[in-house]
Interface confidence: low
């Protein structure tokens, strides 16, 4: 008759580091002491006729245990395979690129340390909850990779790595471990440089707007803009509208920046940079300044008119150019009555990079002269009809401007000058028209001959 040696439990599954109670039993009536062969730490707990119970502790790896006993001089054996399972000690998704260009591939890389049995361990790479790759864990540490084409939709998306230890066939369930997620930042930076709108010339101490625009940028809000005039950084206001970024700044040139300069616009995104440069000439254009030796001159006095401007500026005063750029234009005159109110014009021209810039300035001369009444405008003999409306058209001139009054000889009767009035016979007579100012008096005699109104 053949006797059996049973080992229980048969093919157990337990967690790493755990303990296991093993029972070996036989139906052989004349069996000797039952032995348990194993590399594991074991302890005989109890035994009796045809049976023995052992405790196995700190079971860390898969093992085969063997029970043996001598029955009627023959050895009979029984075995059981222990499967140990353990969760991974570390599941780590490698850092993603700080910025990933849209349309280019990047590699997701997950490292898994520990976890057994490896045959039941799967590594899954995820975007949000979408599975990108599912692979078995092989080496120790296991490394799983997946190549992903970056899209705009991936910006801000979390990527993670999940391990699945499937012990469901053994009735223990599915054990899941997930790495800390890593967020991807994707970007689009066009190859074209920004559009830079800036002045060609900029005068010292003046301000001018500078605009820098770049289209097709994603995410535009993450881009950094640097605008500068030479080495002077400009305070830019950055606006995003969709995929367009616009930076606006005001460029103000300093005196120490005179000469050829560059306006630079840098747009940086995802560690890449696009740059636009425009040449600009900072210039200083002083004047022109027109001066009179005497702004208010006496009739007959000599007046000097001069016009000056900054270096390299050519000035022309009343059509007379200065000898050379940077020099003063000058003219002299004897002040006469006709020069009163005369304007002297000075034009200044500066050449900046082949372009001619023009500025004008003028000054007005005042000449002081005594009062005069223009005989041509003041008829000395007037023939008017009674009871008609007329104007005494007399004009005086002088600087300062004189007061003009026409008084009837032998009486204090005054006729208005330059204003319509009704003429009657009483206006008949000789009038003294006198222009007076602080510079003297001038008198002209005017005779009014009033013809009586005829009733027939």
């Amino acid at each position: 008759q053949e006797f059996l040696l049973r080992v229980e439990p048969q093919n157990p599954v337990l967690s790493a580091g755990g303990s296991l109670f093993v029972n070996c039993s036989t139906d052989c009536p004349s069996s000797e002491k039952i032995a348990l062969e194993t590399s594991l730490s074991k302890e005989l707990v109890a035994s009796g006729m045809g049976w023995a119970a052992f405790n196995l502790s700190n079971v860390t790896g898969n093992s085969r245990i063997l029970c043996s006993v001598y029955c009627n001089g023959s050895q009979i054996t029984g075995s059981s395979n222990i499967t140990v399972y353990g969760l991974p000690e570390r599941v780590e998704l490698a850092p993603l690129p700080p910025w990933q260009p849209v349309g280019q591939n990047f590699t997701l890389r997950c490292q898994v340390e520990g976890g057994s049995p490896r045959t039941s361990l799967t590594v899954v790479l995820l975007r949000w909850e979408e599975e990108l790759s599912r692979q078995p864990a092989v080496e120790e540490p296991a490394e799983v990779t997946a190549t992903v084409l970056a899209s705009r939709d991936d910006h801000g998306a979390p990527f993670s790595c999940r391990t699945e230890l499937d012990m469901q066939p053994q009735g223990l369930g599915l054990f899941v471990n997930t790495s800390a997620p890593r967020q991807l930042r994707t970007f689009v930076l066009p190859v074209t440089p920004p559009r830079l709108v800036a002045p060609r010339f900029l005068e010292v101490e003046t301000s001018w707007p500078v605009d820098c625009t770049l289209d097709g940028l994603f995410p535009a809000s993450e881009a950094q803009v640097y605008l500068a005039l030479g080495d002077q950084m400009l305070n830019a206001t950055v606006m995003n509208h969709g995929d367009t970024l616009t930076a606006t700044a005001t460029a103000t040139a300093r005196a120490d920046q005179e000469g050829a300069r560059e306006i630079v616009c840098n747009v940086t995104l995802g560690g890449e940079r696009r740059e636009a440069r425009e040449n600009l000439t900072v210039f200083s254009f002083l004047g022109p300044i027109v001066n009179l030796s005497e702004p208010t001159a006496h009739e007959g006095s000599t007046v000097t008119v001069s016009c000056m401007a900054g270096a390299r500026v050519q000035v022309t005063l009343d059509g007379v150019p200065a000898a050379a750029p940077g020099q003063t234009a000058q003219l002299q005159l004897n002040a006469t009555e006709s020069d009163d109110g005369r304007s002297f014009f000075c034009s200044a021209t500066l050449e900046v990079d082949g372009e001619f810039l023009h500025r004008n300035s003028s000054v007005q001369l005042r000449v002081l002269y005594g009062p005069k009444i223009d005989r041509a405008t003041c008829p000395q003999h007037l023939k008017w009809k009674d009871k008609t409306r007329h104007v005494l058209q007399c004009q005086a001139r002088g600087n300062p401007y004189p007061e003009l009054r026409c008084l009837k000889e032998g009486s204090s009767r005054e006729v208005p000058v330059g204003i319509p009035f009704f003429v009657n016979v009483t206006h008949n007579g000789t009038y003294q028209c006198q222009a007076s100012s602080s510079r003297g008096k001038y008198t002209l005699v005017v005779v009014m001959d009033i013809e009586a109104f005829s009733s027939h």
């Epitope: 000690e89 490698a94 890389r109 490292q111 340390e113 490394e143």
Partner: antibody
Framework: QVQLVQSGAEVKKPGASVKVSCKAS????????ILWVRQAPGQGLEWMGK????????TYAQKFQGRVTITADTSTSTAYMELSSLRSEDTAVYYC????????????WGQGTLVTVSS | DAVMTQTPLSLPVSLGDQASISCRSS???????????LHWYLQKPGQSPQLLIY???NRFSGVPDRFSGSGSGTDFTLKLSRVEAEDLGVYFC?????????FGGGTKLEIK
């Protein structure tokens, strides 16, 4: 046997950069992590950062963030540590060391590289 | 950061004496995986540091059994049962549970 051999001493001016190399031999370079530690004259040890050559991933101490760059060339089994914007207080001996993932200790060290920052 | 405080700063001993160095951390060094990453290094004069003990109490290969480590949580101790001339130098404790890794200030073991 495991060896980490570092580049020679350097003298640099303030504001300059220095790049120290560490050549590994006697083990598989991508199996271990390389760390950088410095020691100012007569002072203690200060951890700067580490690199996993297998992944190419780095971790830096906050204090050196932005100034230090640790790289690894797996083809030559060499790790590099570059420190920029040097100042006089960066004068120190710079060590590279390696560690296995477990035990998480620095089991082998390079011989050290003295970097002197002086104007 | 985990601040590591070592005492004493200097430890004068006679050869053959027992020596004990203490290391205290400002936060627990028990990792979420259950391990405690506290290590001890010795730096002999003019040399690089060398690993003595890793993970609290494990002697690194080639380290004599007169060195032993103990402790848990935040308090740790390195013991030398019989000091020999080759043991002289500066001892550092270090943790790698938390980033950044940090070191104690060092304890100088010297002859009385």
């Amino acid at each position: 046997q495991v060896q980490l051999v570092q580049s020679g001493a350097e003298v640099k001016k303030p504001g300059a950069s220095v790049k120290v190399s560490c050549k590994a031999s006697g083990y598989t370079f991508t199996d271990c992590i390389i760390l950088w530690v410095r020691q100012a004259p007569g002072q203690g040890l200060e951890w700067m950062g580490k690199i996993n050559p297998y992944f190419g991933t780095t971790t830096y101490a906050q204090k050196f963030q932005g100034r230090v760059t640790i790289t690894a060339d797996t083809s030559t089994s060499t790790a590099y540590m570059e420190l920029s914007s040097l100042r006089s207080e960066d004068t120190a001996v710079y060590y590279c060391a390696r560690k296995e993932a477990y035990p998480d200790a620095m089991d082998y060290w390079g011989q050290g590289t003295l970097v002197t920052v002086s104007s | 950061d985990a601040v590591m405080t070592q005492t004493p700063l200097s430890l004068p001993v006679s050869l053959g004496d027992q020596a004990s160095i203490s290391c205290r951390s400002s936060q627990s060094l028990v990792h979420s995986n259950g391990d405690t990453y506290l290590h001890w290094y010795l730096q002999k004069p003019g040399q690089s540091p060398q690993l003595l003990i890793y993970k609290v109490s494990n002697r690194f290969s080639g380290v004599p059994d007169r060195f032993s480590g103990s402790g848990s949580g935040t308090d740790f101790t390195l013991k030398l049962s019989r000091v020999e001339a080759e043991d002289l130098g500066v001892y550092f404790c270090s943790q790698s549970t938390h980033v950044p890794y940090t070191f104690g200030g060092g304890t100088k073991l010297e002859i009385k």
